[in-house]
């Protein structure tokens, strides 16, 4: 889970070790702050949970691409 002890900066200290289906993802944001120990992606899921993921993993990159495309092509 993301940790925001030093609000307003949210950092990730651990990454999920399970792939999440894109069908469960609602949005994402990148964590690039120098105040954080590592770069990360935080996925917001359809059940309102936020999950930290490793941006170096292929499934994470594919999921971000998928979500980006969803934003670019809004549903009619």
């Amino acid at each position: 889970q993301p940790d925001a002890i030093n609000a307003p900066v949210t950092c990730c200290y651990n990454f999920t070790n399970r792939k999440i289906s894109v069908q469960r993802l609602a949005s994402y944001r990148r964590i690039t702050s120098s105040k954080c120990p590592k770069e990360a992606v935080i996925f917001k899921t359809i059940v309102a949970k936020e999950i930290c993921a490793d941006p170096k993993q292929k499934w994470v990159q594919d999921s971000m691409d998928h979500l980006d495309k969803q934003i670019q092509t809004p549903k009619p």
């Epitope: 289906s21 069908q23 899921t45 059940v47």
Partner: antibody, heavy 119, light 109 residues
């Protein structure tokens, strides 16, 4: 260790309703969903519906739509399943089971509640 | 809805033998969102395998899962006396409903 404890066996008349409870302990109740699964005597598992308190989502299997209501009380870490318009075919063991809403495998189960519908 | 068909309905084997159980989906279970459960008489089901191939906590190594798309397999490498039970597969990619297969009974020959 997560534990789900269900209410006791019930005997009901056709046409009536039953409400089964499922009290969770040993985990963060609101972070997980609760599914309800039933098993008629000698039959397989049948998914009825689920609630995810964190997201405020409730889902029902089409077969039970309009007849089942699933609720949760976060203050007591308890989920409820109410089934109305009971008929003899609803005689079954009813299980609650926990799942992570991001995934869906049922990792902890209640002990089951036998509901007998008989006139 | 995704329909799961398990085969065989009953598997008659002796302790020490290898058991291979099949679960076929009517459409692709993407991301291998498929689980296997064991149920013994009078007991609640117990999770064995999730994400098609990951063993749940405390499950012996003789249980393994494999497969993707529409074809999944649960293998018990060497049956122990306590493994004789009914096994169910379940998909959780559709939300809802989560659906179960009809079960495979593994009985002593």
């Amino acid at each position: 260790q997560v534990e789900l404890v269900q209410s006791g066996a019930e005997v009901k008349k056709p046409g009536s309703s039953v409400k089964v409870s499922c009290k969770a302990s040993g985990g963060t109740f609101s972070s997980y969903g609760i599914s309800w699964v039933r098993q008629a005597p000698g039959q397989g598992l049948e998914w009825m519906g689920a609630i995810n308190p964190l997201a405020g989502h409730t889902h029902y299997a089409q077969k039970f739509q309009g007849r089942v209501t699933i609720t949760a009380d976060e203050s007591t870490s308890t989920a409820y399943m109410e089934l109305s318009s009971l008929r003899s075919e609803d005689t079954a063991v009813y299980y609650c089971a926990r799942y992570d809403g991001i995934y869906g495998e049922l990792d902890f189960w209640g002990q089951g509640t036998l509901v007998t519908v008989s006139s | 809805d995704i329909v799961l068909t398990q085969s065989p309905a009953t598997l008659s084997l002796s302790p020490g033998e290898r058991a291979t159980l099949s679960c076929r989906a009517s459409q692709s279970v993407s991301d291998a969102y498929l689980a296997w459960y064991q149920q013994k008489p009078g007991q609640a089901p117990r999770l064995l395998i999730y994400d098609a191939s990951s063993r749940a906590t405390g499950v012996p190594a003789r249980f393994s899962g494999s497969g993707s798309g529409t074809d999944f397999t649960l293998t018990i490498s060497s049956l122990e006396p306590e493994d004789f039970a009914v096994y169910y597969c379940q998909q959780y990619i559709t939300y809802p409903p989560f659906t179960f297969g009809q079960g495979t009974k593994v009985e002593i020959k």
